[in-house]
């Protein structure tokens, strides 16, 4: 069964800067990745970035750099300043659209006990969404 994992890390050097990493554990080819915060995309969440493996990457503040890390994982750096900056309990979600599996989404946030620079463990929490 395909799974999506999400890892959220606060940067030790910039306490209001976050790195979100997401990956897809499945055999299908990924057609689109959507990263959102504040909840799942389409369910109250706000889109931060949309990544297509070949067409390119779209990102919106406070996202600073979205990129593919491998063919099945992405990372996103958020810079925090002002009202739109993330906080420690912000939920980040990654939705992977894959053929032929469908659409899979998982969410994660910084653990309450996290010290700056420590990673939250990858949290596979797949949600099958039949919206392709």
């Amino acid at each position: 069964t395909p799974e999506v994992w999400v890892q959220v890390r606060m940067e030790a050097t910039e306490l209001s800067s976050f790195t979100i990493r997401c990956g897809f554990l499945g055999s299908g080819s990924i057609s689109l990745v959507t990263v959102s915060w504040g909840g799942p995309n389409g369910a109250g969440g706000t889109t931060l970035a949309v990544l297509h493996p070949e067409r390119g990457i779209r990102q919106w503040a406070p996202a600073r750099q979205a990129r593919w890390e491998t063919q099945s994982s992405i990372s996103l750096i958020l810079e925090g300043s002002g009202a739109s900056s993330p906080c420690a309990n912000t939920t980040f979600c990654c939705k992977f659209a894959s053929f032929p599996e469908g659409s899979w989404e998982a969410c994660g946030s910084l653990p309450p006990s996290s010290d700056p620079g420590l990673s939250a463990p990858p949290t596979p929490a797949p949600i099958l969404r039949a919206d392709l």
Partner: antibody, heavy 114, light 113 residues
């Protein structure tokens, strides 16, 4: 079928503003950004900015920052590009586009002339 | 901003012959993580909006004839029309799809010799 239909041609005076609309259909409007690109007569293509209708998040080309405002109305699946403080060199065809420039509107000619 | 430079500015090719347009970017368009190049090619005919031909440097958009092909990596890219048809007369643009702002080449005008 994806369609982007733009408003008609405009003639404007220097110093005034113009607002061009782009009505989208055939796809989920909120999910993909609408880009705005302009093309002066006989010239190349110049990206102005974009909006993600679902969150109203925008990115602008630094060249146009302060003069261009891009908005979207999800209820009508329509995006808007407003350009202010018009000058003669803003005379161009203005295009909206979506899904990584795979789909384009027909273009709107804006003529700035006194 | 990434600067896109096309060559030549104009090109005249006989019907049925091969046409080649080059595009050079001032920075690499290769995403090392997935080894994809974020470069697109467009065709624009007079009075019409641009039409996407190629994305990811080499992937043809749906419905684009297979005589159009894209190649290259990093900073150097090529659009090839294997056998020129009359309807291919147009201006062709390359585009940086790697980073903001998306930037276009100055265009190459393709005519029939």
């Amino acid at each position: 079928e994806v369609q982007l239909v733009q408003s008609g041609a405009e003639v404007k005076k220097p110093g005034s503003s113009v607002k061009v609309s782009c009505k989208a259909s055939g796809y989920t409007f909120s999910s993909f950004s609408i880009e705005w690109v302009r093309q002066a007569p006989g010239q190349g293509l110049e990206w102005m900015g974009e909006i993600l209708p679902g969150s109203n998040s925008t990115n602008y080309n630094e060249k146009f920052k302060g003069r261009v405002t891009i908005t979207a109305d999800e209820s009508t699946s329509t995006a808007y590009m407003e350009l202010s403080s018009l000058r003669s060199e803003d005379t161009a065809v203005y295009y909206c586009s979506s899904y990584w420039f795979a789909y384009w509107g027909q273009g709107t000619l804006v003529t700035v002339s006194s | 901003d990434i600067v896109m430079t096309q060559s030549p500015d104009s090109l005249a090719v006989s019907l049925g012959e091969r046409a080649t347009i080059n595009c050079k970017s001032s920075q690499s368009l290769l995403n090392s993580g997935n080894q994809k190049n974020y470069l697109a090619w467009y065709q624009q005919k007079p009075g019409q909006p641009p039409k996407l031909l190629i994305y990811g440097a080499s992937t043809r958009e749906s419905g684009v004839p297979d005589r159009f092909s894209g190649s290259g990596s990093g900073t150097d890219f090529t659009l090839t029309i294997s056998s020129l048809q009359a309807e291919d007369v147009a201006v062709y643009y390359c585009q940086n799809a790697h980073s903001y702002p998306p930037t276009f080449g100055q265009g190459t005008k393709l005519e029939i010799k």
